[in-house]
Interface confidence: low
Amino acid sequence: MMTGTIETTGNISAEKGGSIILQCHLSSTTAQVTQVNWEQQDQLLAICNADLGWHISPSFKDRVAPGPGLGLTLQSLTVNDTGEYFCIYHTYPDGTYTGRIFLEVLESSVAEHGARFQIP
């Protein structure tokens, strides 16, 4: 039975050209985390494997940094980075847990005026 829950940073906004940390945390389970995948829509961004360490997809290796922890740091943000991000925890014996983060990348002037992304 899967008892765990994923806590994420939820819906976040960041400034174009800046950086952001995507964080997920698996709690309420004693299952062993074997691998965490970070995905953006149809694209695998990064893998953190318990045995093999980090792997960053080629198209993103210069803009994505592993960590902190099992999180992911996105750098040199563009408006095209706006969208859904998923942390997928592969665990034993529970199976797979998935967390969702929505990132909105704002033009600098918009960000400076305190605009926030909110789901209605």
């Epitope: 093999l52 792997h55 997809s57 080629p58 198209s59």
Partner: antibody
Framework: EVKLVESGGGLVQPGGSLRLSCATS????????MSWVRQPPGKALEWLAL??????????EYSVSVKGRFTISRDNSQSILYLQMNTLRAEDSATYYC??????WGQGILVTVSS | DIQMTQSSSYLSVSLGGRVTITCKAS??????LAWYQQKPGNAPRLLIS???SLETGVPSRFSGSGSGKDYTLSITSLQTEDVATYYC?????????FGSGTKLEIK
């Protein structure tokens, strides 16, 4: 939905030239590495060329077998990938695939070099 | 250039059986390895990237393992639709070389 569609293949004489195109849709083209891969009939896949994304200055890399004869390029405004092939040889006959980082491939286009 | 060696050109396996396809790199590729499945007349299909990560929609009977220079694709409970040629590819350093392929057949 990510789509890659190759065109421009066909029959060409040895020593001739051909330009392959790969029209793409469903993703932000300039964000991704793009490649060309070929497969001669009944043989293995061969990686040919790579053009990196905007973040990496659209720099290119080639396999030894095509370096100096083939040129990979991209039109980011039209989301099209190209492969200019010059001084073609019989051994260049193959199905040519364009591919996007992340495992997306076109259906392939046949190029036959023969007199 | 990094050479990728798939030692078995052909493998014959019983339906429902387990098969292991190996791929050896001539130098360390730090898990930057992909496995592709190709059926006649079709483009290759990405199964696994980063040596271990199963692509969305790929059945869980496929798995990848390995590190350093040695990598493995395993298929359990072999199905008829798994009959295909399997290629490994390193993308640690250009040129991003492929293995010569392993053709899987049903015994």
């Amino acid at each position: 939905e990510v789509k890659l569609v190759e065109s421009g293949g066909g029959l060409v004489q040895p020593g001739g030239s051909l330009r392959l195109s790969c029209a793409t849709s469903g993703f932000t083209f300039s964000d991704y590495y793009m490649s060309w891969v070929r497969q001669p009939p009944g043989k293995a896949l061969e990686w040919l060329a790579l053009i990196r994304n905007k973040a990496n200055g659209y720099t290119t890399e080639y396999s030894v077998s095509v370096k100096g004869r083939f040129t990979i390029s991209r039109d980011n405004s039209q989301s099209i990938l190209y492969l200019q092939m010059n001084t073609l040889r019989a051994e260049d006959s193959a199905t040519y695939y364009c591919a996007r980082d992340g495992g997306y491939w076109g259906q392939g286009i046949l190029v036959t070099v023969s007199s | 250039d990094i050479q990728m060696t798939q030692s078995s050109s052909y493998l014959s396996v019983s339906l429902g059986g387990r098969v292991t396809i190996t791929c050896k790199a001539s130098d360390h590729i730090n898990n930057w390895l992909a496995w592709y499945q190709q059926k006649p007349g079709n483009a290759p299909r990405l199964l696994i990237s980063g040596a271990t990560s199963l692509e969305t929609g790929v059945p869980s009977r496929f798995s990848g393992s390995g590190s350093g220079k040695d990598y493995t694709l395993s298929i359990t409970s072999l199905q008829t639709e798994d009959v295909a040629t399997y290629y490994c590819q390193q993308y640690w350093s250009t040129p991003f070389t492929f293995g010569s392929g392993t053709k899987l057949e049903i015994k």
